[in-house]
Interface confidence: medium
């Protein structure tokens, strides 16, 4: 009677859940930028030049106090985590090759040191950043890693990296130009996922007012129905124990029923199974990462298809 029906209670629960999901979709990906490697394998002849590329994906904070540190280094595959070991590229450390700039800004290594070693790292407005190696030799073969660190107020917030293989070949088996092999489908799926996450973020923000309006209308309709039922049952209300009402302390010995206002009822329903720990549980997507959390474990792309492009 005065109690919300199962359908009404359910609709509120679904409303809460939808709200939570859209909130998560809207807030979740904000910090979730990642690095994609369009190509996982580069096969080049000796003496050729090659440009290794990484791409910064997902939402990028363009705040005035945010900058990105991007760099390159060599590593090896025989470890637990790819790219954890840092070796210099042609005697230049990752510090020597780093770029530092805001969001999707263009930048490049202007110092002579890198250019004297036949290297140049660069970054464009679209999140692509690269290292160009001139006059390749067999010694340049190996695993190359790009690293991106988001910095806010002088401190690193998030870091991600990508890996790719360079094979420099000589002799009759060597290609005449560099041949690049696209990253595995798993990588493509991750790129699509990042794009979808960004899309979901935008859709979530746009749809949020609509969902709130629908939930509000639903609550309003339910409260109107309850008000009508309360008017009808006003004559025989006393003495009925009902979860929809709270018994007040009797005034001058006369028992009285106090009707819960729909809004206060909503507030009391709020800590439901679906939404209770949304903002407080450490494992939820809305929580900041712990000190040791890794945002995106690095992908270790292995070319699993014969697809390739000549560049």
């Amino acid at each position: 009677m005065g109690v919300p029906t199962a359908l009404e209670a359910g609709s509120w629960r679904w409303g809460s859940l939808l709200f939570a999901l859209f909130l998560a979709a809207s807030l979740g990906p904000v910090a979730a930028f990642k690095v994609a490697t369009p190509y996982s394998l580069y096969v080049c002849p000796e003496g050729q030049n090659v440009t290794l590329t990484c791409r910064l994906l997902g939402p990028v904070d363009k705040g005035h106090d945010v900058t990105f540190y991007k760099t390159w280094y060599r590593s090896s595959r025989g470890e637990v985590q790819t790219c954890s070991e840092r070796r210099p590229i042609r005697n230049l450390t990752f510090q020597d090759l780093h770029l530092h700039h805001g969001g999707h800004q263009a930048a490049n290594t202007s110092h002579d040191l890198a250019q004297r070693h036949g290297l140049e790292s660069a970054s464009d407005h679209h999140g692509n950043f690269s290292i160009t190696m001139r006059n390749l030799t067999l010694l340049d073969s190996g695993l190359y890693c790009c690293l991106v660190v988001e910095i806010r107020h002088h401190h690193s917030e998030h870091r991600v990296h990508g890996a790719m293989e360079l094979q420099v070949q000589t002799g009759k088996d060597a290609p005449s130009n560099c041949v690049v092999y696209p990253s595995s489908s798993q990588d493509s799926e991750n790129i699509t996922a990042a794009a979808l996450a960004t899309g979901a973020c935008i859709v979530g923000i746009l749809c949020l007012p609509l969902i709130l309006l629908l939930v509000y209308k639903q609550r309003q309709a339910a409260s109107n129905r309850r008000a009508q039922e309360l008017v009808r049952m006003d004559s025989n209300i006393q003495g009925i124990e009902n979860p929809g009402f709270e018994a007040s302390p009797p005034a001058q010995g006369i028992p009285e029923a106090k009707v819960r206002h729909p809004l206060s009822y909503v507030a009391q329903r709020q800590p439901s199974e679906s939404g209770r720990h949304l903002l407080s549980e450490p494992s939820t997507p809305l929580s900041p990462p712990g000190p040791g959390d890794v945002f995106f474990p690095s992908l270790d792309p292995v070319p699993d298809s014969p697809n390739f492009e000549v560049i």
Epitope: D65, D96, V149, H154, H155, S156, G290
Partner: antibody, heavy 122, light 112 residues
Framework: EVQLVESGGGLVQPGGSLRLSCAAS????????MSWVRQAPGKGLEWVAS????????YYPDSVKGRFTISRDNAKNSLYLQMNSLRAEDTAVYYC???????????????WGQGTTVTVSS | DIVMTQSPLSLPVTPGEPASISCRSS???????????LEWYLQKPGQSPQLLIY???NRFSGVPDRFSGSGSGTDFTLKISRVEAEDVGVYYC?????????FGQGTKLEIK
């Protein structure tokens, strides 16, 4: 050996300007963030400004914001502090300090210069 | 702004004895990336400051192992296991977690 040598201090009238320089040697200057820290006579240390290795981002406390500008010239291995609209309370020894940079995570002013004295007085 | 409060302000110590300096921040200095950028500096008489400890408990290279740092959140401590004559000077704690970066007011360590 890491060396930081400040210069440019002196006596200036209130409202005047001064430009401090810090010459760095013994390390790859462009790979490090840099800071200016000051110490008023008989007082404690106060952070004044900092700049990241690339030079594109700078930070200041409210006490100097809008009056002081930190900059660097990586080609010359030099750090600068342009001080305008100077006040009596800016009188201090100004130190330049190197900030350790770990992948863009700046912390620990690991090497300091000997300081240069700025006196603002009429 | 985060205020760093040190105690005591003056610390007379007998050589060979231990010493302890406390530093309290007005709010947590745990950065959003999980690190706590709490540093300790020593300024010897007539000299520039020098780094002793970074990130709460990491000794800078060349700093004797009699110096140690500890603490978390808002309460931090610098300990000297056995004070030596060369340890005299003013000790400053410093937080670099939140801009503006701030120093404590300093603790003067002197030999009895």
């Amino acid at each position: 050996e890491v060396q930081l040598v400040e210069s440019g201090g002196g006596l200036v009238q209130p409202g005047g300007s001064l430009r401090l320089s810090c010459a760095a040697s013994g390390f790859t200057f462009r790979n490090y963030g840099m800071s200016w820290v000051r110490q008023a006579p008989g007082k404690g240390l106060e952070w004044v400004a900092s700049i990241i290795s690339g030079g594109s981002y700078t930070y200041y406390p409210d006490s100097v914001k809008g009056r002081f500008t930190i900059s660097r010239d990586n080609a010359k291995n030099s750090l600068y502090l342009q001080m305008n609209s100077l006040r009596a309370e800016d009188t201090a020894v100004y130190y330049c300090a190197r900030i350790y940079d770990h992948d863009g995570d700046y912390y620990a002013m690991d090497y300091w210069g000997q300081g240069t004295t700025v006196t603002v007085s009429s | 702004d985060i205020v760093m409060t040190q105690s005591p302000l003056s610390l007379p110590v007998t050589p060979g004895e231990p010493a302890s300096i406390s530093c309290r921040s007005s709010q947590s200095i745990v950065h959003s990336n999980g690190n706590t950028y709490l540093e300790w500096y020593l300024q010897k008489p007539g000299q520039s400051p020098q780094l002793l400890i970074y990130k709460v408990s990491n000794r800078f290279s060349g700093v004797p192992d009699r110096f140690s740092g500890s603490g978390s959140g808002t309460d931090f401590t610098l300990k000297i296991s056995r004070v030596e004559a060369e340890d005299v000077g003013v000790y400053y704690c410093f937080q670099g977690s939140h801009v503006p970066w701030t120093f404590g007011q300093g603790t003067k360590l002197e030999i009895k």
